[in-house]
Each structure stands twice: as C-alpha cells, then as structure tokens.
C-alpha cells in the first residue's frame, strides 16, 4: 500500500533542522550528534536499528577522542546495576544509569533516558570512526540486561509529544572518503518523529514489522537481474530478516548467499573475478572512472505488503553492493569490495540496502516504509527502485518460527 492516506498532523512535511544530521560512511557506521548530562557533554553516537541500548564510552579508550564523564554531570543517576553485552566477536560492558539527553539537530526536547556507561570493551569501538557510543533504536525485547530497560526511543515518545516514528536516509558517497572528507561530508538524515518528503522520490511502500524485537520483516522473493532465485521463501528469512543500520553489508543466509553469488557471477561473467572478491577479501579495481557498472546485475528483494497476497519490491544497484575502498597501493584506480556476505543469523538488510532508500520506521503502525532515496548513487542507465503491487500468495509461510529459547542466552 502506498502512502496516500490523509496526512496526520506532526507526522509529515518538512523537518529542515534534522536534514543532514548524520555523518559517517557505510563501512564504519552513521552517527548523530547527541548531548548527555548537565552541563551538556557532546558525543557522536552511532545510529543502530539492530540493537536497543543507548550505550556510550565512559572511560578512556585508545580509539575514543572523548567520552561521557558521569562525575561532571549534575543530573546523572546511578542505577547500581551492571550490563554485559557479548557479540559473536567482541563485547562491551558497563554500568547503568540515567541522565538528560538531547539531540541538537533533532526535536527540541530533552529526555531522561537510560544510559549504559561503557567501562570496558573489546572489538566494539572502531579506530577512526569518529563515534563514541551507540543509539540502539530497536525494541525493548532485545535490550540488555533484559527487556525492563526502556530503550531511548521509547523514553523519547513517552516523555514528549514526538510521534512514535523515525526515518533514515543514509547516503553512501559512491567513492572512498579519507578522514578529513568524512568529517566534512554529509552522511544523511535521521528524521525523528516524521517523514521529510524532500528525502525521497516516488511513493513509500510499507511492509509489516513481523515482531517487535529487531525490526523484523519478511522477504517473499529474491531476483537477480529479474531472474527468480527460486528458493523456498522460508530460506530468505532463516532464521529472521531484519533492517539494521548498524551493519555494513547485505548479509544473507548461507544457502541464499551461495545461490545469489552463483547468479551474480553468471550475470557478470564477462570478467573473471577472484574467489576472494566474492568472499569480501580481495578488492577489484578499474581505471578511475571506468567501472563497468553495466556488467553487474540489479538485486530485487520482494517484501510482504500491507494487503493480503500483495508484495512490493526494492531493487538495488551494484553502486550499492560494491563498496568503494581506498587503497594507496592502487590509488590510480577505483577499487571496490563485494558488500554482500554470508550470515548464520538470517538476512540483515544493512547499509548496502539502506543507502538506496529512504526508510521509515513507523513504530506506531508496526510497519517499515521504503522509497527511493533522493541521495542514492546511480548512473544514467539504472536507478534504485521501489515498485508494486505484485500478487504473492502464502506469504505468511515465508516467516521462520524460531524455536523458543531464553533470548538472553543468544549472541548478538
């Protein structure tokens, strides 16, 4: 269903003060400036729709230029509780508290929010990324240490009149950025509480949020250059499919990844790429300005629509799934990494997907909207697309039902 219903006050229109409030790049995440404490301490915070904790560096770390100093905040309250978050690789741990938080280029409000003050971490902060914390925008079910810790966005909506919705426009540069360019570059927009029409073209198409934990959606069909991968659609969502701004790549379940790579290889067979390219290990390079985008196929993901038996498709270009990487050794060339990779935890629609689209996280109506981003990288022949409707039967069967376990034992 397209976004043609009557406009609701406060949810549509122009949000000039929030446009261009993100910086960064797909490889190291997009961040927004936030302030915490009294007097306000300014930090850059990674925008992550794949987690639910607001967590900030609160102790010196070799990769941090600055960190949250709780002792300097008159409004900090200690919750006297620790939090430990292990990832498949790495971890962070810290101490829970609350403090006053605001977003300078966001809604003109201040909220008291839960903050995890990170005191120790491993493989969490990224050297040169320029962010000092993470804003988990997903639901309480996956918050640590448990779902009783209210996520930031829930606190924001409860304490203010901000509508229960945010939208993201992540803008991939299309070329590698050095450190100074990143600091000066525009990375995109996080519109809190609404939708900005200037950030997309065409119509918004919505897919239901299957379950409010991650932003879980259902993929019903996958095509490479219009050719159906012809897999049981359950495979596409095994064990889930999520929209995650904190992940760089489009990550696909093993079987789906293998089928997709086979199909992309076949479509681009005019050149022989090394096995290491498909693994994400080797770069491929072309003389500057000569990248043969046309030999690479478009990739379409069909998402469950809002109406029974109706789906729509989002289509990305190689300009989204080939990630530009700077390498001094081959600086005379344009070099790229293959940004589709294998996953053991389901499909992750990361920055590779999101950089093609304006994505609306309509929590109020339990749905996610996609429209073609006004800033997506394309060429004169092809553009990213959001199209529908398509008739698709038995879409409910595409969802995978994860056997019930204690969520707290799962690795993120």
């Amino acid at each position: 269903e397209t976004d043609e219903e009557p406009e609701e006050p406060g949810r549509r229109g122009s949000f000039v003060e929030m446009v261009d409030n993100l910086r960064g790049k797909s490889g190291q995440g997009y961040y927004v400036e936030m302030t915490v404490g009294s007097p306000p301490q300014t930090l850059n915070i990674l925008v992550d729709t794949g987690s639910s904790n607001f967590a900030v560096g609160a102790a010196p770390h070799p990769f941090l230029h600055r960190y949250y100093q709780r002792q300097l905040s008159s409004t900090y309250r200690d919750l006297r509780k620790g939090v430990y978050v292990p990832y498949t690789q790495g971890k962070w741990e810290g101490e829970l508290g609350t403090d006053l938080v605001s977003i300078p280029h966001g809604p003109n409000v201040t909220v008291r929010a839960n903050i995890a003050a990170i005191t120790e971490s491993d493989k969490f902060f990224i050297n040169g990324s320029n962010w000092e914390g993470i804003l988990g925008l997903a639901y309480a079910e996956i918050a640590r240490p448990d779902d009783s810790l209210e996520p930031f966005f829930d606190s924001l909506v409860k304490q203010t009149h901000v509508p229960n919705l945010f939208s993201l426009q992540l803008c991939g540069a299309g070329f590698p950025l050095n450190q100074s360019e990143v600091l000066a570059s525009v990375g995109g927009s996080m519109i809190i509480g609404g939708i900005d029409h200037s950030l997309y073209t065409g119509s918004l198409w919505y897919t239901p949020i299957r379950r409010e934990w991650y932003y879980e959606v259902i993929i019903v069909r996958v095509e490479i250059n219009g050719q159906d991968l012809k897999m049981d659609c359950k495979e596409y969502n095994y064990d889930k499919s999520i929209v995650d701004s904190g992940t760089t790549n489009l990550r696909l379940p093993k079987k789906v990844f293998e089928a997709a790579v086979k199909s992309i290889k076949a479509a681009s067979s005019t050149e022989k790429f090394p096995d290491g390219f498909w693994l994400g290990e080797q770069l491929v390079c072309w003389q500057a300005g000569t990248t043969p985008w046309n030999i690479f196929p478009v990739i379409s993901l069909y998402l469950m629509g809002e109406v029974t038996n109706q789906s729509f498709r989002i289509t990305i270009l190689p300009q989204q799934y080939l990630r530009p990487v700077e390498d001094v050794a081959t600086s005379q060339d344009d070099c790229y990494k293959f940004a589709i990779s294998q996953s053991s935890t389901g499909t992750v629609m990361g920055a590779v997907i999101m950089e093609g689209f304006y994505v609306v996280f309509d929590r109020a109506r339990k749905r996610i909207g996609f429209a073609v981003s006004a800033c997506h990288v394309h060429d004169e022949f092809r553009t990213a697309a959001v199209e529908g409707p398509f008739v698709t039967l038995d879409m409910e069967d595409c969802g995978y039902n994860i056997p019930q376990t204690d969520e707290s034992t799962l690795m993120t």
């Epitope: 190291q28 790429f273 090394p274 290491g276 770069l283 491929v284 390079c285 081959t330 070099c335």
Partner: antibody, heavy 116, light 107 residues
Framework: QVQLVQSGAEVKKPGASVKVSCKAS????????IHWVRQAPGQGLEWMGM????????KYNQKFKARATLTVDTSTSTVYMELSSLRSEDTAVYYC?????????WGQGTLVTVSS | DIQMTQSPSSLSASVGDRVTITCKAS??????VAWYQQKPGKSPKSLIY???HRYSGVPSRFSGSGSGTDFTLTISSLQPEDFATYFC?????????FGQGTKVEIK
C-alpha cells in the same frame, strides 16, 4: 603510510609452538584481511592462510589447517599466527601481508628456526 | 591447487637489457595474477596486479601481460637495482600459489 611490523626471530625445539605477531598501521585495520606466507631457506613462497580483522573469520591452506591458528586483537591492530607441533622443515621466514588486490603490503618477516 | 610454473628459473642479463619472465598456470586464472620482486634478506615487493596493472610507485619499465594461463613480466631496460628474484602468484582461488621464482643475475 601502510606498515606491517612483525615480532623478532625465534628459535624453537621440535614439538614446540611459536606465536608470531604482525602490527598494522597506516590504514583502517578492519578494512583489509591479513595473510601469512612462509619461505623456507632458499625456497619459494607458500601461502598459509588469512584472517578478516573485522570478524576474525579465517581461511587456511589445507596443509596448515591442523597446526596454524590465526587470531586478531583489534584494540592494538595486531594479528597473530601460532604454529604448533613444530618440526625442522618449519624453519622459515614467516611473512604477514595485507590484502587489497592480491598482496600489496608485506611485513619485514620473522625467522623461525626449529632445531633440537 | 593451481600450479604456477615460472621460466626460466634463472637468467643472466646486463644493465639496459630487455628481460622477459613467463609464468604458466595449471588452469585458467583469468587476469588474477600478481608479480613480486624480492632481494636477498628482504620481503617481497609488489610490482604488478591484475596481470598488467602497476602498483603505485612502480617504475614504468616494469610491465605485465597475459590472461587465462599464460603470463609475462617484462623489464624493458634493466637497471642495477632490478637484479633480484621475481615471483608470480595467482590469487584467483585458494590456496594462493606462487611460482618457484626467477633469479635475475648480472651477466
């Protein structure tokens, strides 16, 4: 500029293990894989395996799979190669190299001598 | 595993000579071949990637050609600093494999 600095020479007894380090600088560490290649005295180059510093994913040459272990410490931008059950034919210079297109950057090498 | 067979194993040449080294892959590796130069007691230095592209800073006298199974490294006018051992390498598939090396000596 890109630099890969390896740990110093080692002398080990047969059956022992050795752990060689490779500290990277001058680029975004998690963007590029690190490979290990060895060269026995007067011989050619032999690829041992590689690791992705962003997630510690490893891939080994079948010949070394049972004895080599690659690990990474992102906080210090260092990759380690441990080789166990050493024998005299493991005497070689061990190089780390950074990926890109093929292997554009190499460490200075670490001589490992296995002798009783 | 893909075998990379280099020839000759050694050659003698004079400063200013044109030198050609060949490398044959046991199966099709596309253009996914690199060339390295190694001097005694030093680590390999990368020269050529994708069969014919020079890495940044490599002098233009070094050139590469070939695709499929047959590859060539050419030094158009040998300089004193070019006396070294040269290796080809395929990075088309794992495990990466190298030629046995060609030693370029002073005549």
């Amino acid at each position: 500029q890109v630099q890969l600095v390896q740990s110093g020479a080692e002398v080990k007894k047969p059956g022992a293990s050795v752990k060689v380090s490779c500290k990277a600088s001058g680029y975004t560490f998690t963007n590029f894989w690190i490979h290990w290649v060895r060269q026995a005295p007067g011989q050619g180059l032999e690829w041992m395996g590689m690791i992705d510093p962003s997630d510690s994913y490893t891939k080994y040459n079948q010949k070394f799979k049972a004895r080599a272990t690659l690990t990474v410490d992102t906080s210090t931008s260092t990759v380690y190669m441990e080789l166990s059950s050493l024998r005299s034919e493991d005497t070689a210079v061990y190089y780390c190299a950074r990926s890109g297109v093929s292997l554009p950057y190499w460490g200075q090498g670490t001589l490992v001598t296995v002798s009783s | 595993d893909i075998q990379m067979t280099q020839s000759p194993s050694s050659l003698s040449a004079s400063v200013g000579d044109r030198v050609t080294i060949t490398c044959k892959a046991s199966q099709d590796v596309g253009r996914n071949v690199a060339w390295y130069q190694q001097k005694p007691g030093k680590s390999p230095k990368s020269l050529i990637y994708s069969a014919s592209h020079r890495y940044s800073g490599v002098p233009s006298r070094f050139s590469g050609s070939g695709s499929g199974t047959d590859f060539t490294l050419t030094i158009s006018s040998l300089q004193p600093e070019d006396f070294a051992t040269y290796f080809c390498q395929q990075y088309n598939s794992y495990p990466y494999t190298f030629g046995q090396g060609t030693k370029v000596e002073i005549k």
